[in-house]
Interface confidence: medium
């Protein structure tokens, strides 16, 4: 067991040139507050997913109005420390998720208004007991610096914070076999308490004789790693020798949610479904009111004024769940066409549409030849989403504005020279040669395998390609 | 240390452009947060905020004199120009160019280091 | 706009005497953004005292700040020879900036 804290130092314009606009006006003043939620392991999960390391809300900041004319700076922050505490061991590796909120404090009807300024998200290493970890993350033009670190609670101690520590029983030192706890060197190793084998890398207790597994682990004793691989039992393959999980009580049996929480299975474990006035990640905390400020992603707060009486959330397009901590997946109806990118922004969504389409979802094929000129003669030819042009004799490229050189491609045969002219090539035959690539041999008596030379060249003349 | 340094032409006549310089150094306006104001004070009486510009070029007017003012900067030469046109013996005054400062602890800016200022008199 | 009226427009003290210079605004401005600038014959003002209260970098103790929403002080303890000058309000709350026509202290 043990704590994981936050400390935001400031959150403001980031560098850069666009500084944003101050988030709190004249007329509507306001202050900021901030939410952190923790997922164990270093997997990309999705922002709704269920903080299930644990989640914290801020103190409200001062009160700020913004001053014309300037661009906002730091804004004034809560004070205090963000506080997560975990109940089982500390998984090493985490991901967060920290969002600003404003709440405008103008006097619209309904009260105090919230809203999502920014949202950033990461992946992290940590070892419990560590020194603070300073990091700083960007937000569109937002900036926000923090430290962060996760500490054990007495008698835990370690990196995972699943070593318990008593106080000396003798003033000198420890007992056989018991270490002093660094850094209390007044305190030793408790003696071992947990299960007999339960693994020391992979597994911890906090009561005497059990033996609970960290994430990635299972068995009695926390040996056998979870297997992807496919298994015959429904729960997972049944042999050890396999590594694969054996079948046992599921994440749900007993249903681990209270207060009349509904239990589903998630593929790393169970996501608790809560009634509302009702969250946590086993539904175990109650008592919340709109002044808690419950909803998550600009939802609106509707009734609750009393711990004993039930808010409502009213979400904004693109969010649902009770606290509109859920982002609905608007793109997995494929809006958008002939093979368009679907971004959902939460506040609408868009289509990045492939070359050649266009239209909100990229519906319109668009004319590739419409307003595309070729330069020089070329004509323009349609085609997969892409124009090109066939260009006249002697240029090229993508508009036909580069001059060709109608010699690179050697196109005079048996040996005659190339010459570039204006309006194509001219090529020089060697003796014995004739015809406008100088591909036809002179016969030896004088006559050709040509009909009679035009008029005004004989036999050998460079001949015009035209 | 901060100096910044006003110029100008000293005399105009009515209706005539007034073209302003403040050259300054100690600090860039390319750096993020950083502006640059001007105001200015009539002989013996009161300030008059006129225009001030941003890192960022963002330019802020007074607004009784907007259609009148340009202000501008050039950051690689650490200046920062500003233009009043169809000036009138009511511009008469001591134009000061001032460094925009920041007080982390309020979260506010305000008006910090001032140049000497360069006086200029319309007369016809 | 926001219009600062400060008063008196002169005022003298003795050297040792309690001064206290007003500023009144003709609409509420948040204490963050109300300045003062101290500025003598001759030369450009100076930041005085920001945000109400905090006194610039090089300002002696004896001088101190005060006010809320539409009514600013500035006071000095002890008058001494070197505060004569003028004492300019400013305002950043509200948009334009605007300054009061200040106040000239004298020397008695």
């Known amino acids: 067991a043990g704590v994981f804290e936050l400390q935001i130092h400031s959150f403001g314009p980031g560098p850069g040139p666009g500084a944003p606009r101050s988030p709190c006006s004249a007329r509507l003043p306001c202050r900021l507050f901030f939410r952190v939620c923790l997922k164990p392991g270093l997997s990309e999960e999705a922002a709704e997913s269920p903080c299930a390391l644990g989640a914290a809300l801020s103190a409200r900041g001062p009160v700020y109005t913004e001053q014309p004319g300037a661009p906002a700076p730091d804004l004034p922050l809560p004070d205090g420390l963000l506080q997560v505490p975990f109940r089982d061991a500390w998984p090493g590796t985490f991901s967060f998720i920290i969002e600003t909120w404003r709440e405008e404090l103008g006097d619209q009807i309904g009260g105090p208004a919230w809203s999502l300024l920014a949202r950033v998200a990461g992946r992290r290493r940590l070892a419990a007991g560590g020194p603070w970890a300073r990091d700083i993350q960007r937000a569109g033009a937002w900036e926000l610096r923090f430290s962060y670190r996760a500490r054990c609670e007495p008698p835990a101690v370690g990196t995972a914070c699943t070593r318990l520590c008593r106080p000396r029983s003798a003033p000198s030192r420890c007992g056989p076999g018991l270490r002093p706890c660094a850094p209390l060197e007044d305190e030793c190793e408790a003696p071992l308490v947990c299960r007999a084998g339960c693994s020391p890398e992979h597994g911890f207790c906090e009561q005497p004789g059990e033996c609970r597994c960290l994430e990635g682990w299972t068995g009695p004793l926390c040996t056998v790693p979870v297997s992807t691989s496919s298994c015959l039992s429904p729960r997972g393959p049944s042999s050890a020798t396999t590594g694969c999980l054996v079948p046992g009580p599921g994440p749900c049996d007993g249903n681990p949610c209270a207060n009349g929480g509904s239990c589903s299975e998630t593929p790393r474990s169970f996501e608790c479904t809560c009634p509302r006035g009702f969250y946590g990640l086993r539904c175990e905390v109650s008592g919340v009111t709109c002044a808690d400020g419950p909803c998550f992603n600009g939802g609106l707060c509707v009734g609750g004024a009393d711990p004993d009486s039930a808010y409502i959330c009213h979400c904004p397009p693109g969010f649902q769940g009770s606290n509109c901590e859920k982002r609905v997946d608007r793109c997995s109806l494929q809006p958008c066409r002939n093979g368009g990118l679907c971004l959902d922004l939460g506040h609408a969504l868009r289509c990045r549409c492939r070359a050649g389409f266009a239209g909100p979802r990229c519906e319109h094929d668009l004319d590739d030849c419409a307003g595309r000129a070729c330069a020089n003669g070329g004509t323009c030819v349609e085609g997969g989403g892409a124009h090109r042009c066939s260009c006249a004799l002697g240029f090229g490229g993508r508009d036909c504005r580069e001059r060709a050189d109608p010699c690179a491609a050697r196109p005079c045969a048996h040996g005659g020279r190339c010459y570039a002219h204006f309006s194509g090539l001219v090529c020089a035959c060697a003796p014995g040669y004739m015809g406008a690539r100088c591909e036809f041999p002179v016969h030896p008596d004088g006559a050709s395998a040509l009909p009679a030379a035009p008029p005004g060249l004989r036999p050998g003349d460079p001949q015009r390609y035209l | 240390q901060v100096t910044l340094k006003e110029s100008g032409p000293g005399i105009l006549q009515p209706s005539q452009t007034l073209s302003l310089t403040c050259s300054f150094s100690?600090?860039?306006?390319?750096?993020?947060?950083?502006?640059i104001g001007w105001i200015r004070q009539p002989s013996g009486t009161g300030l008059e905020w006129l225009a001030h510009i941003w890192w960022n070029d963002d330019k802020y007017y007074n607004p009784s004199l907007k259609s009148r003012l340009t202000i501008s900067k050039e950051t690689s030469n650490n200046q920062v120009f500003l233009k009043i046109t169809n000036v009138d013996t009511a511009d008469t005054a001591s134009y000061f160019c001032v460094q925009i400062g920041r007080d982390y602890s309020n979260y506010a800016w305000y008006f910090d280091v001032w140049g000497a200022g360069t006086t200029v008199t319309v007369s016809s | 706009q926001i219009v600062l009226t400060q008063s008196p427009a002169i005022m003298s003290a003795s050297p040792g005497e309690k001064v206290t210079l007003t500023c009144s605004a003709s609409?509420?401005?948040?204490?963050?953004?109300l300045y003062w600038y101290q500025q003598k014959p001759g030369s450009s003002p100076k930041l005085w005292i920001y945000?109400?209260?905090n006194l610039a970098s090089g300002v002696p103790a004896r001088f101190s700040g005060s006010g809320s929403g539409t009514s600013y002080s500035l006071i000095i303890s002890s008058m001494e020879a070197e505060d004569a000058a003028s004492y300019f309000c400013h305002q950043w709350s509200n948009y334009p900036l605007t300054f009061g026509a200040g106040t000239k202290l004298e020397l008695k």
């Open positions: 100690g600090f860039s306006l390319s750096t993020s947060n950083t502006g």
């Open positions: 609409s509420s401005v948040s204490s963050r953004y």
């Open positions: 945000s109400t209260s």
